[in-house]
């Protein structure tokens, strides 16, 4: 039950995280105009990964896409790539994890297969979250560098009288969405990996027990179970004799009313 809850929660957290990563990637407010030096501007600038926008106080907003690939900074391209990789991995992870969910039955899929799929999706979520966090952090670092560079030459005097105020940009809402979303995806991935350990059939030390059947006696001997870590092993626990006794893992592999959430 705890495994199912951990897996389900991991899935939900990852789902929210990936939705957040997608939202952050699409958002226009990755960097917003710093109003500290000019709080009374009638024009507000903000930029995203795909386009830059200008919002006038009158309510009109104009956005222009970056219609060039070669003309864009390498760092921006890198951030785009990281976010897209994060989304793709996350999406694949979600697809895999749906089939890996313990509460969903697909044919006669064994627990070890579900464990492997859970682990795979967990790793994908972790990498996806790391990609998003890395992408957002690279962009944030770029902003900080540019901010202090533009602060150094904030005013360029023209004839000593006229001032040209250079527009500085600070962290936009998308950065915070990206960081939180990346963190959630990462946490979801870790939860999936933890759930995987619970799903995987574990090695159990059974003591030798004698069962006296009518007719002849058969003894169960220890060591008849093949150890399985759940990390790639697809072998089911082997039975020496299929009498009336079942291992704990085998009992769980059949549907019960507790398996459906």
């Amino acid at each position: 039950m705890a495994v199912t809850a951990c897996q389900g929660l991991g899935f939900v957290v990852s789902l929210i995280g990936i939705a957040g990563i997608i939202a952050a990637t699409c958002m226009d407010q990755w960097s917003t105009q710093d109003l500290y030096n000019n709080p009374v501007t009638a024009v507000f600038n903000y930029q995203g990964l795909w386009r830059s926008c200008v919002r006038e106080s009158s309510g009109f907003t104009e956005c222009r896409g970056y219609f060039t690939l070669l003309g864009l900074p390498a760092m921006l391209q890198a951030v785009r790539a990281l976010m897209i990789v994060g989304i793709v991995l996350g999406a694949i992870g979600l697809l895999v994890s749906i089939f890996a969910l313990k509460c969903i039955r697909i044919g006669s899929m064994e627990d070890s297969a579900k464990a492997n799929m859970t682990l795979t999706s967990g790793i994908m979520f972790i990498v996806s979250g790391l990609c998003a966090i890395a992408g957002v952090s690279v962009f944030a670092n770029m902003l900080v560098t540019n901010f202090w560079m533009s602060t150094a030459n904030m005013y360029t005097g023209m004839g000593g009288m006229v001032q040209t105020v250079q527009t500085r940009y600070t962290f936009g809402a998308a950065l915070f969405v990206g960081w939180v979303a990346g963190g959630l995806t990462l946490i979801g991935g870790v939860m999936m990996c933890i759930a995987c350990r619970g799903l995987a059939p574990e090695e159990t030390n059974y003591k030798a027990v004698s069962y006296h059947a009518s007719g002849h006696s058969v003894a169960y001997k220890p060591g008849g179970f093949k150890a399985s870590t759940g990390f790639g092993s697809n072998t089911k626990n082997k039975k020496i004799y299929d009498g009336g006794a079942r291992t704990e893992d085998e009992v769980q592999s059949y549907p019960s009313k507790h398996d459906y959430v």
């Epitope: 009374v40 009638a42 200008v54 106080s57 009158s58 104009e62 105020v165």
Partner: antibody, heavy 117, light 113 residues
Framework: QVQLQESGPGLVKPSETLSLTCTVS????????VSWIRQPPGKGLEWIGV???????NYHSTLISRVTISKDTSKSQVFLKLSSVTAADTAVYYC???????????WGQGTLVTVSS | DIVMTQSPDSLAVSLGERATINCKSS????????????LTWYQQKPGQPPKLLIY???TRESGVPDRFSGSGSGTDFTLTISSLQAEDVAVYYC?????????FGGGTKLEIK
């Protein structure tokens, strides 16, 4: 079509509060900003302040302590209040709609307010 | 506050001739985000409210004759009437629409010579 009409008392006594109303039609006050501008007789234009679609306001730094701009969206009205008036506040007061580039694309006909005892 | 300075204060031009009015701002009105200059030109005829001619320094408002054109960038701007007509006699104002307060220039009175 877009129309703006200023109304209010034509004569205000010194130290009193000047109150004007701008009634608009043809556009929504939730979507567009409305500015107040004044023009003393024979002089140039002076921007007083603005109320934007979201209700936020900006005022001229020289008038900020005396001016208040508000609106009643349901009645499509914008209000200007200027306190502690003096003879220097005698002017034609205009209200105007803000458009692209923050430019004032539609103006009212203006109303002359004289400050005198 | 941004100070807008217009020159000349008054201008007399013959009908059909070119009229040029200048406007200078104390700070740049160029917005880096969209590379547009937030400067507006208005025309005010006697006894009438001002009328919008040009916004973004060079974009003509709909219905404005194409003899009116705006140019300039940063801090220096020009309004040009290519061929002066009798109905163009008015006072012309420039306005900063970039930073609050949205200050006006002192105005240029255009007359026929």
């Amino acid at each position: 079509q877009v129309q703006l009409q200023e109304s209010g008392p034509g004569l205000v006594k010194p130290s009193e509060t000047l109150s004007l109303t701008c009634t608009v039609s043809g556009f929504s006050l939730t979507s567009y900003g409305v500015s107040w501008i004044r023009q003393p007789p024979g002089k140039g234009l002076e921007w007083i302040g603005v109320i934007w679609g979201d209700g936020s306001t900006n005022y001229h730094s020289t008038l900020i302590s005396r001016v208040t701009i508000s609106k009643d969206t349901s009645k499509s009205q914008v209000f200007l209040k200027l306190s502690s008036v003096t003879a220097a506040d005698t002017a034609v007061y205009y209200c105007a709609k803000a458009g692209r580039g923050n430019a004032l694309d539609y103006w009212g006909q203006g109303t002359l307010v004289t400050v005198s005892s | 506050d941004i100070v807008m300075t217009q020159s000349p204060d008054s201008l007399a031009v013959s009908l059909g001739e070119r009229a040029t009015i200048n406007c200078k701002s104390s700070q740049s009105l160029l917005n880096s985000g969209n590379q547009k200059n937030y400067l507006t030109w208005y025309q005010q005829k006697p006894g009438q409210p001002p009328k919008l001619l040009i916004y973004w320094a060079s974009t003509r408002e709909s219905g404005v004759p194409d003899r009116f054109s705006g140019s300039g960038s940063g801090t220096d701007f020009t309004l040009t009437i290519s061929s002066l007509q009798a109905e163009d006699v008015a006072v012309y104002y420039c306005q900063n629409d970039y930073s609050f307060p949205l200050t006006f220039g002192g105005g240029t009175k255009l007359e026929i010579k």
